[in-house]
Interface confidence: low
Amino acid sequence: PEPPTACREKQYLINSQCCSLCQPGQKLVSDCTEFTETECLPCGESEFLDTWNRETHCHQHKYCDPNLGLRVQQKGTSETDTICTCEEGWHCTSEACESCVLHRSCSPGFGVKQIATGVSDTICEPCPVGFFSNVSSAFEKCHPWTSCETKDLVVQQAGTNKTDVVCGPQDRLRA
């Protein structure tokens, strides 16, 4: 018969014949021949291959380097790579998550609009009129000024975006 020019899915063409690809999780040891099947070998403990392949080497699992703030989110298998994520309080610097940076804190005068996640930083917003933040925090929102009136007090010192109002007793009206 004529030698094939194309092969079926999960096969590859070599020496004018179609050989089976190795399944995910296995690497190629030797091509098939007229008399033998493709020889494949499972990937080692810290290795993987995630596609039907003819690779002679498996890929190393990603290392989640704790020095870069990384930890394992999902352990790799022979068919999947390790997925890294960031330690609590840190977030990835990219979609590939090859390193992490500390979540930003919002300075006094700014409050947290959105708390950071493993993949995005803290989003801060300036405290609008009527609100304040007197701390540097990655969690605290802007707090509303104290309402002196509801406490039967009067404003003795106006609030700012960094300080609360200061309330004091009302001046007694003389009879």
């Epitope: 995630d50 596609t51 990219s94 590939a96 090859e98 500390l102 993949v119 930083d121």
Partner: antibody, heavy 119, light 106 residues
Framework: DVQLQESGPDRVKPSQSLSLTCTVT?????????WHWIRQFPGNKLEWMGY???????YYNPSLKSRISFTRDTSKNQFFLQLNSVTTEDTATYYC????????????WGRGTTLTVSS | QIVLTQSPAIMSASPGEKVTLTCSAS?????MHWYQQKSGTSPKRWIY???KLASGVPARFSGSGSGTSYSLTISSMEAEDAATYYC?????????FGAGTKLELK
């Protein structure tokens, strides 16, 4: 609206160093996100060169790691690309871009600056 | 590194025709992103996170796929869609782009 503008020489001799500047307006480069350099060769192939993060952390494409560096001037809201030992293969249009991680794509690109490496 | 192979490299489509561009990754990726570039301009975000349209992108565009196989589809080709489209991944470093598909109007 965030805008990025590349600037630098349009011609460099082989073996020299290349320095490009990206000036950002409308957003502070120290606030968040990652700030990237990407180049496009004459045949239109795009190559990602790496990025400098808002914290100052850098990551370089391993294919360029030995001759590339990114720095920034936060007071001018600029970040810089330096590429050493250039060859004619470095002839390309160089873009700076912002990548909003969490939105997962390059949202804003500069217009690009065209560099020719020739003697 | 993950190699992205786009096909076809060049294609022509008539107005109203359905168009599918494909992007094949050498290893599995979590998401695929697509950019449109017209001559003399920088690439524009077009489809991100595999299937989400960037703002201003007409609804005739759609994206789909998973693992190693992704596609961008135009349900009905229009003259303004003639451009080069690039796929991009960042599931693994380094970030990589496909070589692009140049889509021409027939």
């Amino acid at each position: 609206d965030v805008q990025l503008q590349e600037s630098g020489p349009d011609r460099v001799k082989p073996s020299q160093s290349l320095s490009l500047t990206c000036t950002v307006t409308g957003y502070s480069i120290t606030s968040d996100y990652s700030w990237h350099w990407i180049r496009q060769f004459p045949g239109n192939k795009l190559e990602w060169m790496g990025y400098i993060y808002s914290s100052g952390h850098t990551y370089y494409n391993p294919s360029l790691k030995s001759r590339i560096s990114f720095t920034r001037d936060t007071s001018k809201n600029q970040f810089f690309l330096q590429l050493n030992s250039v060859t004619t293969e470095d002839t390309a249009t160089y873009y700076c871009a912002i990548y909003y991680y969490g939105r997962s794509y390059f949202d804003n690109w500069g217009r690009g600056t065209t560099l020719t490496v020739s003697s | 590194q993950i190699v992205l192979t786009q096909s076809p490299a060049i294609m022509s489509a008539s107005p109203g025709e359905k168009v599918t561009l494909t992007c094949s990754a050498s290893s599995s990726v979590n998401y695929m992103h697509w950019y449109q570039q017209k001559s003399g301009t920088s690439p524009k975000r077009w489809i991100y996170d595999t299937s989400k349209l960037a703002s201003g992108v007409p609804a005739r565009f759609s994206g789909s796929g998973s693992g190693t196989s992704y596609s961008l589809t135009i349900s009905s080709m229009e003259a303004e869609d003639a451009a080069t489209y690039y796929c991009q991944q960042w599931s693994s470093n380094p970030l990589t782009f496909g070589a692009g598909t140049k889509l021409e109007l027939k």
